[in-house]
Amino acid sequence: PRSIDVKYIGVKSAYVSYDVQKRTIYLNITNTLNITNNNYYSVEVENITAQVQFAKTVIGKARLNNITHIGPLDMKQIDYTVPTVIAEEMSYMYDFCTLISIKVHNIVLMMQVTVTTTYFGHSEQISQERYQYVDCGRNTTYQLGQSEYLNVLQPQQ
């Protein structure tokens, strides 16, 4: 079998809301993946599991099941949303993200995603990690491919 390539394209949108009483930030982050099937037969994308970390703490998780199938030598673009919550011991970030004296409130998040594909009863997992800047002070939407090169640094292999 040939490879199945997973490419993390980047953040498609980040929608922010706040709970002032709880000093909590809610970030709904939609990411885009390109999955390429280099085989001469179809493969199923069984599930996508994703998580987002801030300062080494997991702030959000998501799982998509029975997503799609990808035909021979074909590629599919898949969006997935991870609802994240920055709260409790990280509530100090609420002050930063709602700071009225500045307009740009960048934070670095680590996006982790694992794609499980199956073909002929065989299962394969491919994982990707990227560090991304997100502005926790405002809503952001991207045109296709606009955020492709946003990774701050590649994680250690």
């Epitope: 953040v11 980040a14 922010v16 706040y18 002032v20 993200c97 709602t98 009225i100 004296s101 500045i102 307009k103 740009v104 409130h105 960048n106 991304q132 800047y133 997100v134 502005d135 002070g137 405002r138 809503n139 952001t140 939407t141 991207y142 045109q143 606009q146 955020s147 090169y149 946003l150 701050v152």
Partner: antibody, heavy 118, light 113 residues
Framework: EVQLQQSGPVLVKPGASVKMSCKAS????????IHWVKQSHGRSLEWIGV????????NYNQKFKGKATLTVDKSSSTAYMELNSLTSEDSAVYYC???????????WGQGTTLTVSS | DIVMTQSPSSLSVSAGEKVTMSCKSS????????????LAWHQQRPGQPPKLLIY???TRESGVPDRFTGSGSGTEFTLTISSVQAEDLAVYYC?????????FGAGTKLELK
């Protein structure tokens, strides 16, 4: 329906002060910042400053520090701007504008016309 | 402060024409972290308050017709109206939304021939 209802036109003498209001309705007042913008006759727009109704935090354009004072009354969901030591240069339309925290201006009030003349 | 320069100051057009107006900033409006340009376009019709058209340089506000398109990056931005309608006659302002103090261009006035 979101509304920012501003007080009516004012005519004042040079040297006086004026306090204009912006009453918010149709949303949770404390969840959004209120900005104030000046538009002199036939001219562009100037940002005066912003206030957070939740905690009264403010940020002023240096140019308007000492000229404008921004306040809010949470109980009536009303934002105020006081302008002091008025001169003819202060004659303008003043808008209050809403933003969800650091997001973009999404709703503008209808404006308050201030005329400073002796 | 970031200075916003718009050109031309006025445009005379016929209904159905395509129109392009320019906005230049004295400093970059690109958030180098998330690669988003923090520029907005507002439309002000005669006797009315301004109204948000476009934010993030290229994202149309909800309810804004798709004949309005924003583009550009860094310090150079463009607002295009693909086919001008009578209701588009207004003054268009670009706005720095990247850093305080927020600043506006002097405006481009769109008039009918």
């Amino acid at each position: 329906e979101v509304q920012l209802q501003q007080s009516g036109p004012v005519l004042v003498k040079p040297g006086a002060s004026v306090k204009m209001s912006c009453k918010a309705s149709g949303y949770t007042f404390t969840d959004y910042y209120i900005h104030w913008v000046k538009q002199s006759h036939g001219r562009s727009l100037e940002w005066i400053g912003v206030i957070s109704p939740y905690n009264d935090n403010t940020n002023y354009n240096q140019k308007f520090k000492g000229k404008a004072t921004l306040t809010v009354d949470k109980s009536s969901s009303t934002a105020y701007m006081e302008l002091n030591s008025l001169t003819s240069e202060d004659s303008a339309v003043y808008y209050c504008v809403r933003t969800y925290y650091s997001n973009y201006f999404d709703y503008w009030g209808q404006g308050t016309t201030l005329t400073v003349s002796s | 402060d970031i200075v916003m320069t718009q050109s031309p100051s006025s445009l005379s057009v016929s209904a159905g024409e395509k129109v392009t107006m320019s906005c230049k900033s004295s400093q970059s409006l690109l958030n180098s972290g998330n690669q988003k340009n923090y520029l907005a376009w507002h439309q002000q019709r005669p006797g009315q308050p301004p109204k948000l058209l476009i934010y993030g340089a290229s994202t149309r506000e909800s309810g804004v017709p798709d004949r309005f398109t924003g583009s550009g990056s860094g310090t150079e931005f463009t607002l295009t109206i693909s086919s001008v309608q009578a209701e588009d006659l207004a003054v268009y302002y670009c706005q720095n939304d990247h850093s305080y103090p927020l600043t506006f261009g002097a405006g481009t006035k769109l008039e009918l021939k």
